[in-house]
């Protein structure tokens, strides 16, 4: 870290490696919860016009698709993969693509994905063909 930039104690706004290199924060779609028309498709665009700088460099992009008897919503946020989101671990946080995986939630259909390339939660993928370790 350069001498003119203070290093504060317990600073989670800055992530460094062993050489002192600094991690830049992720750029993610961040519209919180919005109504969605995404249904029965292999993939969908988020239709979120807001790309935000994640507050902490360790955060990744997350998308949550929910369908119940009344509506469909899509949530786009930044989140720290060390912490659960909607009570689920972000197990795919290192993926460059947002591959939706179904989670068990009573009373609704619930899919969630996380990823770590810029704006990767803009394109959410439901197709089974991506659910193996696809290099693309």
């Amino acid at each position: 870290i350069p001498p003119h930039v203070q290093k504060s104690v317990n600073n989670d706004m800055i992530v460094t490696d062993n050489n002192g290199a600094v991690k830049f924060p992720q750029l993610c779609k961040f519209c919180d919860v919005r109504f969605s028309t995404c249904d029965n498709q292999k993939s969908c665009m988020s239709n979120c016009s807001i790309t935000s700088i994640c507050e902490k460099p360790q955060e990744v992009c997350v998308a949550v698709w929910r369908k119940n008897d009344e509506n469909i919503t899509l949530e786009t946020v930044c989140h720290d993969p060390k912490l659960p989101y909607h009570d689920f671990i972000l197990e795919d946080a290192a993926s460059p693509k947002c591959i939706m995986k179904e989670k068990k939630k009573p009373g609704e259909t619930f899919f969630m994905c996380s990823c770590s390339s810029d704006e990767c939660n803009d394109n959410i993928i439901f197709s089974e063909e991506y659910n193996t370790s696809n290099p693309d």
Epitope: I1, P2, D17, G20, A21, F24, I53
Partner: nanobody
Framework: EVQLLESGGGLVQPGGSLRLSCAAS???????RMWWVRQAPGKGLEWVS?????????YYARSVDGRFTISRDNSKNTLYLQMNSLRAEDTAVYYC?????????????????WGQGTLVTVSS
Amino acid sequence: EVQLLESGGGLVQPGGSLRLSCAASGFTFTEYRMWWVRQAPGKGLEWVSAIEPIGNRTYYARSVDGRFTISRDNSKNTLYLQMNSLRAEDTAVYYCAKQIPGRKWTANSRFDYWGQGTLVTVSS
């Protein structure tokens, strides 16, 4: 030699405006995503805003979105930050930094060349 030189900081009252500049030299400005980053006294770094090298696509932290505007003049190798509706919590040293788009980490322990910073104080 790579240099980033920030200027334009100062004392301003709450609700006021300031325009910061960052003059870049020693590298191909149009190859880099540029950032404004700030550090309040005793706090960590906060990543304020970024702008792509070409096309001028911009990004903001939620804390400043709608109040701050980042821009760049590639012909002058200069980065700008227009800060409006300033608040006491915007008080910080403001740095500019460069990032190769797509690279998640700086190249070395000097933050891939950061400037020395310019102090912005918002107080009545």
